[in-house]
């Protein structure tokens, strides 16, 4: 199925040019999306091209500049947040990145009613997190690992926590491992719906081993970065959840929410918090051995000013074939009765589907079913449930938005997006206004992305928010590669693949093949999305065929495929890449003497193992920031899939699945190993150990490090990286420069 057919006739071909590496590095063909910043059922904010903050009212069609670019510029603001009472805006400047989601910044509060910055009781700097209450203009913020509360922006702050300490106690913000592997946010505090209560997590990292690495900087001596980072089997953070009444914060102070007994009996994690009403909260907990999750609904006891979590309101989710959930355990979406909820989990056939839980999980009513998966619940209203799935036409790499009418019986299902722009748009996400009065659809491809606004009642398209016209025009004279998404059936396993083919692809010719792999548990690489990136250039200009394959362990095709890698990382992911390569060779247009594989992070691990598989299939390959041993990676992630590195658990496979154990097998391949020295995520240690093992085995290899760069290898390093990898591949494939 050719998803991006060439738009060219032969007569026009001489006016067309191939993509260049410069195009990719300059971001010449990047696209824009439009996500409205909803502030009501019919209004949203958007930062205009000239940096004014504009409020749009869909119903009246009017727009209002609520904050001028002049005001934004006066404090060098790069972000903003309107208070729910619309009296104030916080302006964020001096952005300083920390980890994946976290950053610190300076915050200024601007009073919209008098057009002046709030003076007196200004916020300290730098702040780790700041947010408005959902109603009014209370402020909660985290400074130096402690939480503070302001009733109004100009008021003095009330300090909620006092024990915060760098790298020891984190209040209202996650530590490294919770940020990266559990919460996927920079915050760990949650306002109740009307701002009466504030819940927060406290993470105690006192006993966690510390990863230390040098940051070279420009000084005479490098400084050492220390991060409490629990690797597999190590001591984990200790988490506690507290709730404070923000109206009278000093009255009883923070109240701890009890942990369910079946969770508290051994090491555990807190996984998410969902407010239901101002006086009901839902917490999710997970055993350290991550196949048991407990959802606990707790109620405020006015008489005792405490939170009560009755056992009758505990819902257990357990996996017998793998870990609980997909990548994370799904979160509940509560219905209007404030006790029943909708949640995605595996059905009896092993497909993730929406279930409605009224009393017990055992009595859950299955809302969706089929040999496909429900992926996200966007919104539940009185009469509709909006969700995304990959059901349509049985392509796992697509995402369409569906509406189920829950107000009527039997519920009826409608695909909102399936036939909107069928060729252009097969991968959607959505963003809903209050009460789903309106919603924005963001289509990511396979054609040029487009964002549109829709009526939440009729699903009628109201207007195009962003259609990337300039990109469309810029691509008119570019010879883009062709892309196809197909599947291989091998030994009862379906291997979906995406193949990126040179513009003048001819099946009778032979082409070098590059496999791009990620392959991590619950990931998906074969998606119907638009991209003009490095591999597009390699196909367009350098005439390579590039393939991406979703093997065992990948997501959204059922538990059989997903959980196949449970406790056995590094085996089937690699096997399936190799199997796919053999099938590609059989197709007749691959030059089997010129096959390479590359990947980043988990993909670096898989590419390394594939190169060291001893098959003789690969001439060369690249590993960027690879994991080399699961003993070196974070506990939360690693143990989810591998269990513990102990003798009585899974130590043997931890040892067997290292890259170092296969050092000898790199002798007959060209290997390029790349890593940033300041990688907080997959530590440089991983590549250092690979290099040491290769040296000890007297195996030649190439390597590149990026000083002071993290897992993303951003900025100028990106240009250097892709230039370097291009040279390596062209040399490997004997392509002239």
């Amino acid at each position: 199925i050719v998803l991006r057919p060439s738009r060219v006739h032969n007569s026009e071909e001489n006016t067309m040019r191939a993509l260049t590496l410069k195009d990719i590095l300059n971001g010449t063909f990047s696209y824009k999306t439009f996500f409205p910043n909803w502030i009501s059922g019919q209004e949203y904010l958007h930062q205009s091209a000239d940096n004014n903050i504009v409020l749009y009212n869909i119903e009246t069609g009017q727009s209002y500049t609520i904050l001028s670019n002049r005001t934004m510029k006066s404090v060098n603001a790069s972000n903003y947040g309107l208070s729910p009472d619309r009296q104030f805006v916080y302006l964020e400047s001096d952005y300083s990145k920390l980890w994946r989601y976290s950053y610190t910044a300076t915050y200024y509060i601007y009073d919209l009613s008098n057009g002046e910055f709030v003076r007196g009781n200004e916020l300290p700097r730098p702040i780790q997190y700041l947010c408005w209450s959902p109603v009014g203009s209370k402020l909660a913020y985290v400074y130096q690992n402690n939480i503070y509360l302001k009733q109004r922006p100009g008021d003095p702050p009330f300090q909620i926590t006092f024990n915060g300490r760098e790298n020891k106690i984190f209040n209202g913000i996650p530590d490294w491992v919770y940020e990266e592997e559990m919460l996927a946010t920079k915050y760990a505090l949650w306002w109740s719906p009307n701002g009466k209560f504030l819940a927060y997590a406290e993470f105690n990292d006192t006993d966690i081993p510390v990863i230390a690495y040098s940051y070279y900087g420009d000084e005479q001596y490098p400084r050492t970065i220390n991060i409490p980072y629990p690797k597999a089997g190590a001591k984990n953070p200790v988490v506690r959840i507290f709730i404070i009444d923000t109206t009278y914060p000093a009255y009883v102070g923070p109240q701890e929410v009890p942990v369910p007994a079946m969770i508290a009996s051994s090491d555990y994690y807190f996984s998410w918090l969902t407010w239901v009403t101002d006086e009901r909260v839902c917490l999710q907990w997970l055993k350290r051995v991550q196949n048991v999750s407990v959802l606990s609904i707790c109620d405020f006891r006015e008489d005792w000013q405490t939170w009560d979590c009755p056992k009758t309101q505990e819902h257990i989710e357990e996996s017998r074939t793998g870990w609980a959930g997909g990548f994370f355990v799904s979160t509940p979406v509560f219905s209007y009765d404030a006790i029943s909820y909708y949640k995605i989990f595996s059905d009896k056939d092993g497909y993730k589907h929406i279930h409605y839980i009224k009393d017990t999980v055992e009595n859950a009513i299955q809302i969706t079913s089929g040999k496909w998966e429900a992926i996200n619940i966007f919104r539940v209203t009185q009469d509709s449930l909006f969700y995304s799935s990959n059901e349509f036409e049985e392509y796992p790499g697509r995402r369409n938005i569906y509406r189920i009418s829950i107000g009527s019986y039997p519920p009826s299902k409608k695909c909102v997006t399936c036939h909107l722009r069928k060729e252009r748009c097969q991968y959607y996400t959505a963003s809903f206004s209050d009460y789903a009065k309106y919603y924005a659809l963001v289509c990511y491809g396979p054609g040029i992305p487009i964002s549109t606004l829709h009526d939440g009642r009729t699903d009628q398209e109201i207007k195009i928010l962003e259609e990337n016209k300039e990109l469309e025009n810029a691509l008119k004279n570019i010879q883009l590669p062709k892309e196809e998404i197909k599947k291989l059936e091998v030994d009862e396993i379906t291997l979906w693949y995406k193949m990126i083919l040179p513009p003048q692809f001819d099946r009778s010719k032979k082409y070098p093949l590059l496999i791009q792999v990620y392959g991590g548990p619950c990931s998906q690489s074969v998606r119907s999305v638009f991209a003009v990136n490095w591999i597009s250039y390699l196909a367009s200009k350098e005439g390579m065929v590039i393939a991406l394959v979703d093997g065992r362990g990948t997501a959204f095709q059922g538990d059989k495929l997903l959980y196949a890698v449970y406790r056995k990382l590094g085996v089937y992911e690699v096997e399936d890449q190799i199997t796919a390569v053999r099938k590609f060779i059989e197709m007749g247009f691959i030059d089997e003497k010129r096959i390479a594989i590359w990947g980043w992070s988990y993909g670096g691990y898989v590419s390394s193992l594939a190169l060291a598989s001893g098959t003789g299939l690969f001439k060369c390959g690249i590993a960027v920031a690879p994991v080399s041993s699961w003993e070196y990676y974070a506990s939360v992630y690693t143990e989810r899939f591998m269990g513990l590195p102990t003798k009585d658990d899974n130590l043997e496979h931890y040892k067997n699945s290292t890259v170092m154990a296969r050092a000898e097998y790199f002798r007959n391949v060209d290997y390029l190993l790349i890593h940033g020295t300041a990688d907080d995520n997959v530590h440089f240690q991983n590549s250092a150990q690979i290099a040491k093992a290769l040296v000890n085995a007297q195996v030649d290899f190439q390597a590149m490090w990026y000083s002071d760069q993290n897992h993303g290898l951003s900025g100028l390093s990106t240009n250097h990286l892709y230039t370097h990898m291009t040279h390596f591949l062209k040399q490997c494939f004997s392509l002239s420069d």
């Epitope: 209004e43 409020l55 009017q62 209002y64 500049t65 009472d85 919209l112």
Partner: antibody
Framework: QVQLVQSGAEVKKPGSSVKVSCKAS????????INWVRQAPGQGLEWMGL???????NYNQKFQGRVTITKDNSTSTAYMELSSLRSEDTAVYYC?????????????WGQGTLVTVSS | DIQMTQSPSSLSASVGDRVTITCKAS??????VAWYQQKPGKAPKLLIY???YRYTGVPSRFSGSGSGTDFTLTISSLQPEDFATYYC?????????FGQGTKVEIK
Amino acid sequence: QVQLVQSGAEVKKPGSSVKVSCKASGFSLTNYDINWVRQAPGQGLEWMGLIWTGGGTNYNQKFQGRVTITKDNSTSTAYMELSSLRSEDTAVYYCVRGGPLVWYALDYWGQGTLVTVSS
Amino acid sequence: DIQMTQSPSSLSASVGDRVTITCKASQDVSTAVAWYQQKPGKAPKLLIYSASYRYTGVPSRFSGSGSGTDFTLTISSLQPEDFATYYCQQHYSNPRTFGQGTKVEIK
């Protein structure tokens, strides 16, 4: 600071028209709606209509065909014209600022213009 | 049109009293209700918008609540300068409509 200054009192004959002006300062008419509200002697408040930031209008059905609201952004002045005047149109007419920051409630009021319709 | 019915139409109270004025909408107006204060010979002044948000500079003794069809304006401790007429208004849809007013007089 924000101000809405209205034109002076008017005495009009039944059947004639009146045009009340409202000069805005401290804000731009391209960024706020201007509403017109009237109050008959000893009576309550009655919303007549508005002119949006973009220049579009919305009128109370009760006045449809008789009221016209316009504005001149360059002079920051809004106007309300009421035709076919009757004695019951005797009232104080207010121009009032509205906008999204107060959920389209009416936050700044002019001082009012008394229009007397009398033969 | 949406009708706004205010009650009482007048009330007598003393300084320091807690005063409550209610307003009922003929249909659901969500939280789009504002309250105004008007003194004789003067233009009305905005007190509360979106049912519960106090407008800038309005004393904290004034508070608003409600959603849907039932709304309340409360003056927690009546001050001499609070004797005036109070109006509710829905700003949910056009035409914007006002309640008939509540006159707060000195007892």
